[in-house]
C-alpha cells in the first residue's frame, strides 16, 4: 500500500537515525524521489509499496552512534588518524620545499629591454604622396583613406614627405612650418595624425629642406637652414608628430653637431619621439661617425646596397655593422629613399624581405617594396618615385605594362605573392620576442649562404638560412660557431620559405637542409634547457 510520509527537515538531527541507518523502503533506494513542490520546508518522500524488498534491505543497518564512537576511540584508530595527519603535513611541506627549490634553481627570466615603438616593427616611407596615391589624387586627405592598407601591412610608423613649401633652391621660399597647398592644409594633416593614432600608426615627418632642388641643404646657407629646422621641430612636435626624418645629410656641413642638437630637441620633448637621418653613403666609417655623437639616432644608408648579392659578403657586412655599432639599435634598408628594385633583381626581393625583417633592428621600406614595385617596368616613371600600382587602372599611360600580379589588388588575392610574404613577415616581426629584441648569432652554413639565429631567453627561437646564389645548395650548418645559449636542434619546423612548394609546419632535419636558388627559409624551434 502506497503512503506519503512528510518529514520536517528541521527535525533531522544527528541523534536520530541517519538516512543510511534507516531501513530502505525501496530496492537500492531507487524509488525515492521528489513527489511534489517544496511546501513550508517539507519534502514529500514517495515510499515504495514493495514491503518484501524493504524487509530484505533492512537486514543490515550498520553501527549505531554509540558503537561507532566506541570503535573510533580505540588506540588503533587513534594511532592511524595521527599517522595519516602527520603524513599529510609532511607531504604538504615536502611539496612546498620542492616548489621553493624549483623556483630558486630555475633560470631567471631575462628582463625585457625597454622597447620604444619603432623597435616593434617596420617603418614605411611615402616620399611622394602623388605617386603613392596615383596621379591627380595625391594629398593628405587621400592618404587618410590608405591607412587601413598600412594597418594590413602591420607597419608601426609612416615616414611622410617632405610635404612643406619649397621653391626649388630658394631658401626664402622654403617654409618648413607650412604645408604645400598641393598636398593639403594643416587641418588635413591634423586629421591624418588623429586617424593614424587610432590605428596605432605613428607619423614621422620628413623635413629635408630643399627636397625639390639640387642640394637638399642649400649648401651655402647652412645656419639659416639649421635655424629653420630647429623651429620646425618644435612646431611639429607640438602638432603631435612622432618623429622626424632628414635625408642627404652627407650634404650638410657639421652634420653630427646639427643632428645632436636636433636630437636634443626631439628627445627633450619626449623620449618616445624619433629622429631618423638618411645618407647616400655606404662607407661604414662615415656611418659610424654620424652615429657616435647621437645615441638614439636611427640612420638609413646605402650600406647594404653594396652587398653584391652574395651570401658571404652580406654576412660580412651585417656582422661588421652589428659589431661596430655594439648594443645600439640599428635600422635596416638598402638606401635612404629608393625602392628595393633599384638595387635588386626580382628573384632576390623575397630573400631580402626575409632578411630585413629578421635582422636585429628596425626594417625600413619604401612604398611599393611590399609588391616589388619596379620603376624600370613602368616606362617614363621616375626611378625614385614610380606610381604605386593599386590595381590595373593605376598606370593608364601604358596599360600593357601592368599585369594583375604586379598590383596590390592582384597580390592580395594570391597567398604566394610577395605582398602576402611581406604581411606574414611583418606579423611575425611584431609579435615574436626573439625577433623583437632577441640576440643575433650568425654562423657558417657553407659558401653562398648566410644563416643566423635569433633567440630571446626561453622563447621560441628562429633560424634563418638564405641562399643568395642562383644554384641550389646544401646547407652545412656549423653549430660550433654558436655559443652554448644558442645551440641548434637536430630538427626545426618550417615557418615559411620564400619559394613555393615546401610544406609549412613540417620539421626539417638541419643536417640535410637543401635550399633552392635564391631561397630563404625561416625555421622555428623551442628553447631547450
Amino acid at each position: 500500500m502506497s503512503q506519503d510520509t512528510e518529514v520536517d527537515m528541521k527535525e533531522v538531527e544527528l541523534n536520530e537515525l541517519e538516512p543510511e541507518k534507516q531501513p530502505m523502503n525501496a530496492a537500492s533506494g531507487a524509488a525515492m524521489s521528489l513527489a511534489g513542490a517544496e511546501k513550508n520546508g517539507l519534502v514529500k518522500i514517495k515510499v515504495a509499496e514493495d514491503e518484501a524488498e524493504a524487509a530484505a534491505a533492512a537486514k543490515f543497518t550498520g553501527l549505531s552512534k554509540e558503537e561507532l564512537l566506541k570503535v573510533a576511540g580505540s588506540p588503533g584508530w587513534v594511532r592511524t588518524r595521527w599517522a595519516l595527519l602527520l603524513l599529510f603535513w609532511l607531504g604538504w611541506l615536502g611539496m612546498l620545499a620542492g616548489a621553493v627549490v624549483i623556483i630558486v634553481r630555475a633560470p631567471r627570466c631575462r628582463e625585457l629591454p625597454a622597447q620604444k615603438w619603432w623597435h616593434t616593427g617596420a617603418l614605411y616611407r611615402i616620399g611622394d604622396l602623388q605617386a603613392f596615391q596615383g596621379h591627380g589624387a595625391g594629398n593628405l586627405a587621400g592618404l587618410k583613406g590608405r591607412l587601413d592598407y598600412l594597418s594590413s601591412l602591420k607597419v608601426k610608423g609612416l615616414v611622410l614627405g617632405p610635404i612643406h613649401k619649397n621653391q626649388k633652391d630658394d631658401v626664402a621660399q622654403t617654409d618648413l612650418l607650412q604645408i604645400d597647398p598641393n598636398f593639403g592644409s594643416k587641418e588635413d594633416f591634423d586629421s591624418l595624425l588623429q586617424s593614424a593614432k587610432k590605428k596605432s600608426i605613428r607619423v614621422i615627418l620628413d623635413l629635408t629642406p630643399n627636397y625639390r632642388g639640387e642640394n637638399s641643404w642649400f649648401s651655402t646657407q647652412v645656419d639659416t637652414v639649421a635655424t629653420k629646422v630647429k623651429d620646425a621641430l618644435e612646431f611639429w612636435l607640438q602638432a603631435g608628430v612622432d618623429g622626424f626624418q632628414v635625408r642627404d645629410i652627407e650634404n650638410l656641413k657639421d652634420a653630427s653637431s646639427f643632428l645632436a642638437e636636433w636630437q636634443n630637441i626631439t628627445k627633450g620633448f619626449s623620449e618616445d619621439r624619433l629622429l631618423i637621418a638618411g645618407t647616400n653613403s655606404s662607407d661604414l666609417q662615415q656611418i659610424l661617425s654620424l652615429l657616435e655623437s647621437n645615441k638614439d639616432l636611427l640612420l638609413t644608408s646605402s650600406y647594404l646596397s653594396d652587398s653584391g648579392s652574395t651570401g658571404e659578403h652580406t654576412k660580412s657586412l651585417v656582422t661588421q655593422y652589428l659589431n661596430a655599432t655594439g648594443n645600439r639599435w640599428c635600422s635596416w634598408s638598402l638606401s635612404q629613399a629608393r625602392l628595393l628594385t633599384s638595387f635588386l633583381p626580382a628573384q632576390l626581393l623575397r630573400l631580402y624581405q626575409l632578411m630585413l625583417f629578421t635582422l636585429p633592428g628596425t626594417p625600413v621600406f619604401s612604398y611599393g617594396d611590399e609588391i616589388g614595385l619596379d620603376a624600370a617596368a613602368l616606362p617614363g616613371q621616375p626611378m625614385e618615385a614610380p606610381v604605386m600600382l593599386w590595381d590595373e587602372s593605376s598606370f593608364p599611360d601604358i596599360p600593357g605594362a601592368v599585369s594583375a600580379n604586379m598590383t596590390v589588388k592582384g597580390q592580395s588575392e594570391d597567398p604566394g605573392s610577395l605582398l602576402s610574404l611581406f604581411r606574414r613577415l611583418s606579423d611575425q616581426r611584431s609579435k615574436e620576442r626573439s625577433l623583437l629584441h632577441g640576440d643575433f648569432h650568425a654562423f657558417s652554413a657553407g659558401p653562398g649562404l648566410f644563416s643566423y639565429i635569433r633567440h630571446w631567453d626561453q622563447n621560441e627561437r628562429f633560424l634563418v638560412v638564405l641562399n643568395f646564389g642562383d644554384v641550389g645548395l646544401s646547407a652545412g650548418l656549423q653549430a660550433s660557431d654558436l655559443p652554448a645559449s644558442a645551440s641548434l636542434p637536430a630538427k626545426a619546423d618550417l615557418l615559411l620559405s620564400t619559394q613555393p612548394g615546401r610544406e609549412e609546419g613540417s620539421p626539417l632535419e638541419l643536417e640535410r637542409l637543401k635550399l633552392e636558388p635564391h631561397e630563404g627559409l625561416l625555421l622555428r624551434f623551442p628553447y631547450a634547457a
Partner: antibody
Amino acid sequence: QVQLKESGPGLVQPSQTLSLTCTVSGFSLSSYGVIWVRQPPGKGLEWMGIIWANGNTNYNSALKSRLSISRDTSKSQVYLKMNSLQTEDTATYYCARHYYDGTHYYGYFDYWGQGVMVTVSS
Amino acid sequence: DTVMTQTPSSQAVSAGEKVTMSCKSSQSLLYSENKKKYLAWYQQKPGQSPKLLIYWASTRESGVPDRFIGSGSGTDFTLTISSVQAEDLAVYYCQQYYNFPYTFGAGTKLELK
C-alpha cells in the same frame, strides 16, 4: 609655337659613331619626353628610343647595345649617339615630342622634326 | 612586342572616292578601365615628316579635316577617308601605345589611279 629640329652630319663612315642633336622650342624638356624614330629609304618607321621628362631612357632592344640618348635641358637639346654604324643604318632620323596632358604620358607623338638624312658609306 | 599589320600595302584611288585601310594588332589595344583604344594614325606625305592624324583610334587631331574617320574594335582598326582629295596622297601608318615598346605598322601607300 612647338618646334623640333634635327641636326647632324649627312655622311658617316661605317663603324663610326653617329651624333645627332634635336633642338626644341615652345615646350620644356622637363615636362615632355622626346623620341627618336628612323626611316630607311622607301621603308617604314622604326621607333629607336625615348628620353622621358624625368631623364629616364628606354631603347629599342635591337639597338640598345649601341644607342645612347641624353639631353641638356638648359639648352633645350636632346642628343642621339649610335656607334658601330653599318650601311643598313642609312635612314632619315626624326625626333618627335611624346604627348603629355599634364598628368599622363600617352604614347602618341604630336609634333615631329623635319628629319635629317644620314648616309653610311665609305 | 605588339605586331601591327597594315593592309593593303598600297592602294590606287581616284579623287572623290571613299577609301578604307586596315590595321590589325597582335593583341587587344582596348583598355577596359577607361574604355579607350590605344591606337594612333599618322600621315606622311612624300618628302615630309609624319603628322599625327588620329589618336584614341577615333579622335581627330585639331586641324585634321573631318573626312578622316578612325574606327575599330580591340584588335581591328580602320582609317576611312570619306572623299579622297589630291593632297591626301601619302603613306598612312598606324601605331599602338598600349604596350611598350611602341610599334608602328608597315604603312599603307595611297596612290592615284
